[in-house]
């Protein structure tokens, strides 16, 4: 498919990316799969400006982003470098808390009600945000 110049229907354009905001909840892996079926990925936050944009659209609701440490180190799903990149964790987070009683720690990052980030159990059914870069999006309906 050739590159497109505008976002798909129901997606929001911002700074050469397209964003889709869910209104239901899924576990992190299911949300990740949803975005990827749309030729997209869970949102990767690379700046304070992008953080404020996403925060404005999701409101005070727990919402998954494309950041996890399920294989050890924290990783953004699109390969963006975590160590040198933008971060907006809540104080004392991430803490890989084991006290929730659900088994294991906390390996997936989400926006909290004030927009700052927390790590949580990946199975929790939170809302999510998909993102795709405008010049990588296809003219077709969503692709793999």
């Amino acid at each position: 498919g050739s590159e497109r110049t505008c976002c798909p229907v129901n997606w929001v354009e911002h700074e050469r990316s397209c964003y889709w905001f869910s209104r239901s909840g899924k576990a992190w892996a299911d949300a990740d799969n949803y975005c990827r079926l749309e030729d997209a990925h869970l949102v990767v936050v690379t700046s304070w400006e992008e953080q404020k944009f996403v925060q404005h659209h999701i409101g005070p609701v727990n919402t998954w982003m494309g950041l996890h440490d399920q294989n050890g180190p924290w990783k953004w799903v699109d390969g963006t470098d975590y160590e040198t990149g933008f971060k907006n964790w809540r104080p004392e987070q991430p803490d890989d808390w084991y006290g929730h009683g659900l088994g294991g720690g906390e390996d997936c990052a989400h926006f909290t009600d004030d927009g700052r980030w927390n790590d949580d159990v990946c199975q929790r059914p939170y809302r999510w945000v998909c993102e795709t870069e405008l010049d990588k999006a296809s003219q077709e309906p969503p692709l793999l």
């Epitope: 299911d30 990740d32 990827r36 079926l37 990925h41 799903v77 699109d78 390969g79 969503p142 793999l144």
Partner: antibody
Framework: QVQLQQSGPGLVKPSQTLSLTCAIS??????????WNWMRQSPSRGLEWLGR?????????DYAVSVKSRITINPDTSKNQFSLQLNSVTPEDTAVYYC??????????WGQGTMVTVSS | DIQLTQSPATLSFSPGERATLSCRAS??????LAWYQQRPGQAPRPLIY???NRATGIPTRFSGSGSGTDFTLTISSLEPEDFATYYC?????FGRGTKLEIK
Amino acid sequence: QVQLQQSGPGLVKPSQTLSLTCAISGDSVSSNSVAWNWMRQSPSRGLEWLGRTYYRSKWYYDYAVSVKSRITINPDTSKNQFSLQLNSVTPEDTAVYYCASWTRGAFDIWGQGTMVTVSS
Amino acid sequence: DIQLTQSPATLSFSPGERATLSCRASQSVGSYLAWYQQRPGQAPRPLIYDATNRATGIPTRFSGSGSGTDFTLTISSLEPEDFATYYCQHRRTFGRGTKLEIK
């Protein structure tokens, strides 16, 4: 355990329609977390993705630009299968055709493959 | 469209040796890259997804690495059944494959 079973003729005449079916067991064609794909493989083109369908409250269809004017992929919920139709075939469409499911990062389950020869 | 380049087309090894296969993308694909093995007369089967994650049932001698544009599939100690053709894939695009043959 998901399995895909392909069926259809192995010989098609030029200008006619290639029709293949992929029967799904162990999952539903209407699953909202899987995409159902057709691919083909030939020495000249390598592994080539042809198209897919998936369900998200409604059916979506995506086709490769190279075959877009000739291809149709149809799900059949009553038989839990999906099909490929490729119209106006030429000898260049001779290939091994595969159906495959896609979840998350890979085409994880493949049919056994069907060698289709286009010849008069 | 993103192009995936696998080179060389053929590699020769002896059983027990370590094999490293390369895949290069024409632009960054993040970590969204998969590897497949195909034996003669069979369909491809997934080995690695998301660049580093082994698919279900894949032996630990197979590992994947890389991010962005350069990716590697490593087979730590080749078994006789590993001599096959290997493909990388991003979304709907496949590389042309690298054939592992017995030296």
